[in-house]
Amino acid sequence: QAGPLPKPTLWAEPGSVISWGNSVTIWCQGTLEAREYRLDKEESPAPWDRQNPLEPKNKARFSIPSMTEDYAGRYRCYYRSPVGWSQPSDPLELVMTGAYSKPTLSALPSPLVTSGKSVTLLCQSRSPMDTFLLIKERAAHPLLHLRSEHGAQQHQAEFPMSPVTSVHGGTYRCFSSHGFSHYLLSHPSDPLELIVSGSLEDPRPSPTRSVSTAAGPEDQPLMPTGSVPHSGLRRHWE
């Protein structure tokens, strides 16, 4: 008796975070024996879509011409071979940006900060939101969530960083979101360049979360410290 069919691989091109109106292609790769591919979307009737395999039959394409709110969500795919259906793929989370107006990102007291000092990145939205995300460009673990407790709506979130080291320097953007769908994000804020001076011999910050020892400085997750004053927001790592 053969074991279960291996699970397919599911991915999105050009990526899984897509601006409203832009195209995205979801690919499901199985085996050469695949006869049919099926894509399921969480909380939607199954199957969400079916496609015949593209030659040489080991993958299928699911096309989304223009990203809208309807497409944001969690997907899994399967393939059917002569012996039956495969295991489900690992999930793919498709996130749409542009659902809400862009927040404003600023640095207090200044985006030019001396190593060893403190800086707070402030993400402010025009309308109350309950989730704020800070993203650092070219970081392997770029997302830091601040999510309000008990559904309280906030106009801003503070991301304190102390002590600042060279690792913190770089380009940041923030997004805001509502808790009812973390697959829908605002337009990105304008970029903020955080410049750390006097940091040639800075020690690495001690992480507050375990990180792979293979990670280099740019792979380090953001390490804000301290409380989040008066915000009612709770920190979540992604």
Epitope: W20, G21, N22, S23, T25, W48, D49, R61, S63, P65, S66, T68, E69, D70, Y71, G98
Partner: antibody, heavy 123, light 107 residues
């Protein structure tokens, strides 16, 4: 059977604003992209822009500074405004529908078109 | 912006001939391509979307192929009623640009 009908003045003075409306009958505006396309006499098709049911828009960069597309879901219609018109804006103007979500049939192309309305820019 | 280039701009063929129209995108557009037929004095009609998916009611002599940058519309056996101008159009990310059109006539 969904039908689209363009309406608006057939003659517009130069430098004025062209205003057209497309009325959607026999179906919903929801989950579709609604486009305006034009065709100058004897020439090809030119995409002007689209609006989604949420009100989000995208425009042809060559016309963006002069174009506004809006939607009124309660009246089941969407509209085009093109400002500062010249003789080069003389054309047949079409409204058209493109599916916005799986299951809406067209899978990407514009599957329903209005009959078109001729707009002449002249004094 | 991505440009769409059709060739030829016009062609003349006999009834029963196999006719091929090509459309080239200046950058890859996956399979986000539609083909339209516009008969003289009429409105455009969607023939094919997703590069190769035939719309319901379109005769099977029409077919589409291609992905990425190079696409083809084929009429396997040209009929008198196929006299029209054919347009390709990209519909991935805006702008949804049309090709300049290919006019098909009967010899």
């Amino acid at each position: 059977q969904v039908q689209l009908q363009e309406s608006g003045p057939g003659l517009v003075n130069p430098s004025k604003t062209l205003s057209l409306t497309c009325t959607v009958s026999g179906g919903s505006i929801s989950r579709y992209f609604w486009s305006w396309i034009r065709q100058p006499p004897g020439k090809g098709l030119e995409w002007i822009g689209y609006i989604y049911d949420s009100g989000s828009t995208n425009y042809n960069p060559s016309l963006k500074s002069r174009v506004t597309i809006s939607v009124d879901t309660s009246k089941n219609h969407f509209s085009l405004k093109l400002s500062s018109v010249t003789a080069a804006d003389t054309a047949v103007y079409y409204c058209a529908r493109r599916g916005g979500y799986y299951g809406s049939g067209s899978y990407g192309g514009m599957d329903v078109w209005g009959q078109g309305t001729t707009v002449t820019v002249s004094s | 912006d991505i440009q769409m280039t059709q060739s030829p701009s016009s062609l003349s063929a006999s009834v029963g001939d196999r006719v091929t129209i090509t459309c080239r995108a200046s950058q890859g557009i996956s399979n986000y391509l539609a083909w339209y037929q516009q008969k003289p004095g009429k409105i455009p009609k969607l023939l094919i979307s997703a590069a190769s998916t035939l719309q319901s009611g379109v005769p099977s002599r029409f077919s589409g192929s291609g992905s990425g940058t190079d696409f083809t519309l084929t009429i396997s056996s040209l009929q008198p009623e196929d006299v029209a101008t054919y347009y390709c159009q990209k519909y991935d990310s805006a702008p949804w640009t049309f090709g300049q059109g290919t006019k098909v006539e009967i010899k």
